[in-house]
């Protein structure tokens, strides 16, 4: 018995294609690339029907439906734009992922273009089905930092957004009687990590051993400008406190530490990371000018509430900054060796300041970033962390501020942050 002639579905075909079909003949219905066989609301790659004894087909011819990649996955810190009208998500449609500029940049300068494949997945030529990564942009404040030609003596008020990486670290040890509390600065490296000096996060209860403060006792404020007004600031508790394992309290060698924030902070005009330098044992070149910012909080009797709310009895309510030249290593070593005491300026430190002394050598909290503008990458790079020297004998002649040489610790920092160097290339100074 002969079965009726078959019409292939639109965007599909039937095989084998014959003039006549008889009892027990079978045909396979398939669809063109980018289409799927649809039968009873079920999608499939092919569908088989058979010519029955009574001259009828075992099933109706299914339809071919265009493949739909559906709504693309959301990209953290990113946006999606559709290239086709009506935001189509069907076969051969194109979308483009982009990062929330200017605060995030796409890793490896990926195009971000994804095409809906015949398999029903969004595909990128380089990443395949993996989503791109939006990394925080670093070292590019929303406001231009001042030209470094004219020297600044003493401190200047910083405009909001001038030092978007600046963090205020508040340590309050409630396990002590009375409660112990102190303050320091730090620098935002990513949405989740703060770089600071180890001595800021060390518990002074122990002198023969280096013990970090408990993470529960650490609060970090970002986007803070005036300590009397914390409404615009982001505060975060610490998930981890990591001191450099070789930090030495005798001479402050390896005075570097990290705080991992409990939650990533949203980046914006007043909260942006600073760039890490490349691994460079020499550190910043002598006479290069850098900037250090800080509130200069030094009064031991100030309560946390006073600092954050009223800002009373602080050196400055508004974030200050100062411009300082890097001092040749030999000159700095000599200046400390000539004084009584076993001060050692190691290869993990560099000095900055002016021979004639002045307030410039002691402005800025411990742990704050000494940043230098890198002409090649056009970004601000953290070359130093306020470590010792200046704050104790402010303004003394030829008493330079001593800074942790961050470039010696780049590998250690990446290792702690759990990011392979390749992932963070955009953050490394070129």
């Amino acid at each position: 018995n002969e079965c009726p002639e078959l019409q292939p579905p639109v965007h599909g075909k039937i095989e084998p294609s014959q003039a006549k079909y008889f009892f027990k003949d079978q045909v396979l219905v398939s669809c063109d690339t980018g289409y799927k066989v649809l039968k009873d609301n079920v999608e499939m790659d092919t569908f088989q029907i058979e010519c029955l004894k009574d001259g009828t087909w075992s099933n109706k011819i299914p339809t071919c439906k265009i493949v739909d990649c559906r709504a693309p996955g959301e990209l953290e810190h990113g946006l999606i734009t559709f290239s086709t009208r009506n935001n189509l998500t069907t076969y051969k449609s194109e979308i483009k992922y982009s990062c929330q500029e200017p605060y995030y940049k796409m890793l490896n300068n990926n195009t971000g273009i994804y095409t809906c494949s015949a398999q029903g997945v969004w595909m990128n030529k380089v990443l395949g089905r993996s989503l791109p990564t939006c990394l925080p942009e670093c070292g590019q404040p929303s406001r231009s930092l001042p030209s470094l030609v004219k020297r600044i003596i003493g401190g200047r008020n910083a405009e909001p957004g001038l030092f978007p990486w600046q963090a205020l670290i508040v340590v309050e040890d409630t396990s002590r009687v009375p409660n112990d509390k102190w303050f320091g600065s730090g620098a935002l490296l990513s949405a989740s990590w703060i770089l600071t000096a180890a001595h800021v996060l060390r518990s002074q209860r122990r002198d023969t051993t280096v013990i970090p403060v408990s993470k529960e006792h650490v609060t970090v404020y970002l986007g803070l400008h005036d300590v009397r007004d914390k409404s615009g600031a982001v505060n975060s508790s610490a998930a981890r406190v990591v001191l450099h394992p070789d930090f030495n309290i005798q001479n402050y060698n390896h005075d570097i530490a990290l705080v991992q924030l409990q939650e990533p902070v949203p980046l914006g005009p007043h909260v942006m990371p600073v760039c890490l330098p490349r691994l460079e044992p020499e550190g910043p070149a002598p006479h290069m000018l850098g900037l250090v910012a800080g509130w200069g909080i030094s009064n031991p009797n100030v309560t946390v509430d006073e600092i954050i709310s009223s800002g009373t009895r602080t050196l400055s309510d508004v974030l200050q900054y100062v411009k300082l030249p890097v001092v040749p290593h030999a000159e700095c070593k000599t200046s400390y060796e000539s004084r009584s005491g076993n001060y050692s300026v190691t290869e993990n430190m560099f000095c900055a300041g002016y021979y004639e002394g002045g307030k410039d050598t002691c402005l800025g909290d411990s742990g704050g970033a000494f940043v230098i503008f890198d002409d090649l990458s056009q970004r601000w790079v953290v070359q130093g962390l306020v470590s010792w020297g200046g704050p104790e004998e402010c303004g003394s002649k030829q008493v330079y501020g001593v800074y942790t040489k961050v470039s010696n610790y780049v590998d250690w920092v990446w290792e702690q942050m759990g990011l392979p160097q390749s992932v963070v290339e955009p953050q490394v100074e070129r």
Partner: antibody, heavy 116, light 112 residues
Framework: QIQLVQSGSELKKPGASVKVSCKAS????????MSWVRQAPGKGLKWMGW????????TYADDFKGRFVFSLDTSVRTPYLQISSLKAEDTAVYFC?????????WGQGTLVTVSS | DVLMTQTPLSLSVTPGQPASISCKSS???????????LNWLLQRPGQSPKRLIY???KLDSGVPDRFSGSGSGTDFTLKISRVEAEDVGVYYC?????????FGQGTKVEIK
């Protein structure tokens, strides 16, 4: 090279106050706490408490709460011990010692004599 | 407060002979960080104290190696392998584990 130099001996009348200083040199001052220790004539040593030189927060042993105050002037690297309402039993040599717990370097001591 | 008990309270030693001082604490001095903050110092006549040993057995720089410290938990010992004339004075143990830090009553060492 690490030195703690204390102020000189004091003779005070009961009810008066005294302030003992301890000038530190030769190390990063804010890296170590500073302890204060009392030694009464012919007696042993008694730990009075310590001050965190980074935060400026003092901690007192129970026997030294009230009339005893530890303070700091970081700019001149000097901790101070002030005793108010002096009593005859406060007569002692008062030592400063580097460290909250280490007490690895000691000042030469300051004799405070309370006598009418 | 942790009570530190030293024995003997005085000791008269012939030069070149060994000496041993015991220090017992009323509770274990092992801290939660795994370290034992037990220290020894010497106060020579008319002088300020000088730390000799920290963390039970670590010698301070400049301290002769004839001095040694040992012990754990609540029982500690300071040993001088060969006493010299400059070793005279009062030896104190003290603990920095439990607040407030406390000293032993002192052991006076003199030369025979």
């Amino acid at each position: 090279q690490i030195q703690l130099v204390q102020s000189g001996s004091e003779l005070k009348k009961p009810g008066a106050s005294v302030k003992v200083s301890c000038k530190a040199s030769g190390y990063i001052f804010t890296s170590y706490g500073m302890s204060w220790v009392r030694q009464a004539p012919g007696k042993g040593l008694k730990w009075m408490g310590w001050i965190n030189t980074y935060s400026g927060v003092p901690t007192y042993a129970d026997d030294f709460k009230g009339r005893f105050v530890f303070s700091l002037d970081t700019s001149v690297r000097t901790p101070y011990l002030q005793i108010s309402s002096l009593k005859a039993e406060d007569t002692a040599v008062y030592f400063c010692a580097r460290g909250g717990e280490a007490m690895d370097y000691w000042g030469q001591g300051t004799l405070v004599t309370v006598s009418s | 407060d942790v009570l530190m008990t030293q024995t003997p309270l005085s000791l008269s030693v012939t030069p070149g002979q060994p000496a041993s001082i015991s220090c017992k604490s009323s509770q274990s001095l092992l801290d939660s960080d795994g370290k034992t903050y037990l220290n020894w110092l010497l106060q020579r006549p008319g002088q300020s104290p000088k730390r000799l040993i920290y963390l039970v057995s670590k010698l301070d720089s400049g301290v002769p190696d004839r001095f040694s410290g040992s012990g754990s938990g609540t029982d500690f010992t300071l040993k001088i392998s060969r006493v010299e004339a400059e070793d005279v004075g009062v030896y104190y143990c003290w603990q920095g584990t439990h607040f407030p830090w406390t000293f032993g009553q002192g052991t006076k060492v003199e030369i025979k």
